[in-house]
Amino acid sequence: APVRSLNCTLRDSQQKSLVMSGPYELKALHLQGQDMEQQVVFSMSFVQGEESNDKIPVALGLKEKNLYLSCVLKDDKPTLQLESVDPKNYPKKKMEKRFVFNKIEINNKLEFESAQFPNWYISTSQAENMPVFLGGTKGGQDITDFTMQFVSS
């Protein structure tokens, strides 16, 4: 069955925007004015996932690119990556678990927990111009809260 999707940008709670850093990495930094056009536009889709009260399973693709955020083990550590997919087959309702994030939405703040690695979250560093990564701590130095902005076509 078809599912809903939307186009959005994400900023961390310090208002850092997400931009491409090379072909398969995102970084977070403060942008202003025309530089805001560098922001990555996500295509966020509702997908099938495990049931939990305030968690909504989503996939995060890059709009009009065949790239999705995914979570895999690298050197025995849960790692966030941009993964290339066959555009003929994606997005789909039953996404592989590595592509699924549990969106937790409280007071207009969003967290994205990896479905593959519970309690690991899409995170940014306090520092400028650092990679977006999968972090295993909440409420520490690293930032796990984001705001979402709809993108007009």
């Epitope: 599912v3 809903r4 999707s5 939307l6 909504i56 939405e105 076509s153």
Partner: antibody, heavy 119, light 108 residues
Framework: EVQLVESGGGNVQPGGSLRLSCTAS????????MAWVRQAPGKGLEWVGI???????YYASWAKGRFTISRDNSKNTVYLQMNSLRAEDTATYYC?????????????WGQGTLVTVSS | EIVMTQSPSTLSASVGDRVTITCQAS??????LSWYQQKPGKAPKLLIY???TLASGVPSRFSGSGSGTEFTLTISSLQPDDFATYYC??????????FGQGTKLTVL
């Protein structure tokens, strides 16, 4: 106070058009998913459609082609454009905010505006 | 498209009674089921989401259960304020959203 107020309802002849407005106060509509739900007199609730960003709108099958949802973030307002109206479109039309993106449920509702299609 | 079917259509009960309303989905919707209360001339009010989670400010006498295609709304001890019409609705991010036809709860 956080609230939604619908306006634009009234009497319209069959085949006519009407545009309903839903204006938010106490919060910004710009990043809220907004739906329209209608209720014919003495009948049950019927989902019309929902808008996320302006390119991402979804409709009940019966509403596709005749009804269009749009938004003007600068006015903190969402619209429902209704064309080729029929007697069976007579209803109270509510706008509602999705509780969380893709939750598919609605925690904040307006008071409704009545549309009567009659010659 | 999903069809939601509620039963009964009308239900008469007395203050203090335990009442149960059922809702059936035409296909599995996992736990994506919400319940609303509506009083005459008023907008619906969200009671329960994700089949069993109480919405903010809703009294604990309301509870929901079920998954897949079969769901129930239970009011453990009916209060005068509870006489209203109740609707179930499939939720989540599927393209189609549908409400049940409603259950009118009246005083016996």
């Amino acid at each position: 106070e956080v609230q939604l107020v619908e306006s634009g309802g009234g009497n319209v002849q069959p085949g006519g058009s009407l545009r309903l407005s839903c204006t938010a106060s106490g919060f910004s509509l710009s990043n809220s998913a907004m739906a329209w739900v209608r209720q014919a007199p003495g009948k049950g609730l019927e989902w019309v459609g929902i808008i996320y960003d302006s390119a991402s709108t979804y409709y009940a099958s019966w509403a596709k082609g005749r009804f269009t949802i749009s938004r003007d973030n600068s006015k903190n307002t969402v619209y429902l454009q209704m064309n080729s109206l029929r007697a069976e479109d007579t209803a109270t039309y509510y706008c509602a905010r999705e509780r969380a993106i893709f939750s598919g449920d609605f925690a904040l509702w307006g008071q409704g505006t009545l549309v009567t299609v009659s010659s | 498209e999903i069809v939601m079917t509620q039963s009964p259509s009308t239900l008469s009960a007395s203050v203090g009674d335990r009442v149960t309303i059922t809702c059936q989905a035409s296909q599995s919707i996992s736990s994506w089921l919400s319940w609303y209360q509506q009083k005459p001339g008023k907008a619906p009010k969200l009671l329960i989401y994700k089949a069993s989670t109480l919405a903010s400010g809703v009294p604990s006498r309301f509870s929901g259960s079920g998954s897949g295609t079969e769901f129930t709304l239970t009011i453990s001890s009916l209060q005068p304020d509870d006489f209203a019409t109740y609707y179930c609705q499939n939720a989540g991010g599927g393209v189609s959203i549908a409400f049940g036809q409603g259950t009118k709860l009246t005083v016996l």
